[in-house]
């Protein structure tokens, strides 16, 4: 049987996904090619928003924010002016660790 | 093809916990993130959480209160939602789906590809 | 946290006719709309994202339109498969607990005649 991953051995924390009468290696973050044995950047995705900067550190990627942008992947606008606005904030991951 | 199938509904009785499952493939989570949202019979949607797994960061709507935790398991391959102190009111449908966060630079948060859904029926 | 009022509840209309849906948000929250449709025993089906792109496969009867707090749906040349349930949805900056969230709309049936 062609789509088994029975015999597939995915390295680096990877697993094994069947379909279209084939199987292949869905790799954890870092890792890419046919068995994830190859090193990859998570960053080369651009996962952030309005020109932030991706950096990949142990415990997961970080986005440096732009001027004028907050949020952990720097999705929010930061105006300082008006009820309904955000509140100013330098860039970067501010204001506080969204993490709960 | 991208996909995510929820399981471990079922019948739980007041005051209980139960643990759902969503098994997801076909997508890089450099750039997704999972959602849980739920529907009461005959009712609108509402939202959960989401774990945004590449940043290691789980966020929950306000009326979660702590009873609600996601989590991800296997090289993130796996999602988990455990419900605790469930009540009749948490009688729903719940859903796993994926939302685009920032794809190519560019910020979507749209949830774009959904579960079929798993029954859980709070009830004595 | 955001409120999103979506208005009518429940809307008809004939074959061939136009539908609008709109949502309101009770904070600023720029462009991150989406709009859904769900169909009983369904789960739902992204239409529109980022207030006004759509989502691959959907129709060009369907438009999205507004910013800010104000947000439209609009279907045209309606047809009976458009019979269904729609949601809008936001994402927001909850000041609250300083990170972002999501919230949706009640809903509005669409029945079609």
């Known amino acids: 049987d062609l789509d088994d991953c029975a015999g597939r051995a995915c390295a680096n924390g990877g697993t094994c996904v069947e379909g279209g009468g084939a199987h292949r290696c869905s790799c954890a973050l870092g890792f890419g090619g046919r068995d994830c044995r190859e090193r990859a950047d998570p960053c080369a995705a651009r996962p952030c928003a309005h020109g932030g900067r991706c950096y990949a550190h142990f415990s997961g990627l970080v986005c440096a924010c732009a001027p004028g942008y907050m949020g952990a992947r720097c999705e929010f606008p930061v105006h300082p002016d008006g009820a309904s606005a955000l509140p100013a904030a330098p860039p970067g991951l501010r204001p506080g660790d969204p993490q709960r | 093809q991208e996909q995510l199938v929820e399981s471990g509904g079922g019948l739980v009785q007041p005051g209980g916990s139960l643990k759902l499952s969503c098994k997801v493939s076909g997508f890089d989570f450099s750039n997704y993130g999972v959602s849980w949202v739920r529907q009461a019979p005959g009712k609108g949607l509402e939202w959960i959480g989401y774990?945004?797994?590449?940043?290691?960061?789980?966020y929950y709507a306000s009326w979660v209160n702590g009873r609600f935790t996601i989590s991800s398991h296997n090289a993130q391959n796996t999602l988990y939602l455990q419900l605790n102190s469930l009540t009749a009111a948490d009688t729903a449908t719940y859903f796993c789906?994926?939302?685009?966060?920032?794809?190519?630079?560019?910020?979507?948060?749209?949830?774009?590809?959904w579960g079929p859904g798993t029954l859980v029926t709070v009830s004595s | 946290d955001v409120v999103m009022t979506q208005t009518p509840a429940s809307v008809e209309a004939a074959v061939g006719g136009t539908v609008t849906i709109n949502c309101q948000a009770s904070?600023?929250?720029?462009?991150?709309l989406s709009w859904y449709q769900q169909k009983p025993g369904q789960p739902p089906k992204l239409l529109i994202y980022?207030?006004?792109t759509l989502a691959s496969g959907v129709p060009s009867r369907f438009k999205g339109s507004g910013s800010g707090t104000q947000f439209t749906l609009t279907i045209s040349d309606l047809e009976c498969a458009d019979a269904a349930t729609y949601y809008c949805q936001s994402y927001y900056y909850s000041s609250g607990s300083s990170y972002g969230a999501f919230a949706f709309g009640g809903g509005t049936e669409v029945v079609v005649k």
């Open positions: 980022r207030t006004s």
């Open positions: 904070q600023n929250i720029y462009s991150y």
């Open positions: 774990i945004d797994p590449a940043f290691g960061r789980t």
């Open positions: 789906v994926r939302v685009a966060l920032v794809v190519a630079g560019v910020a979507y948060y749209g949830m774009d590809v």
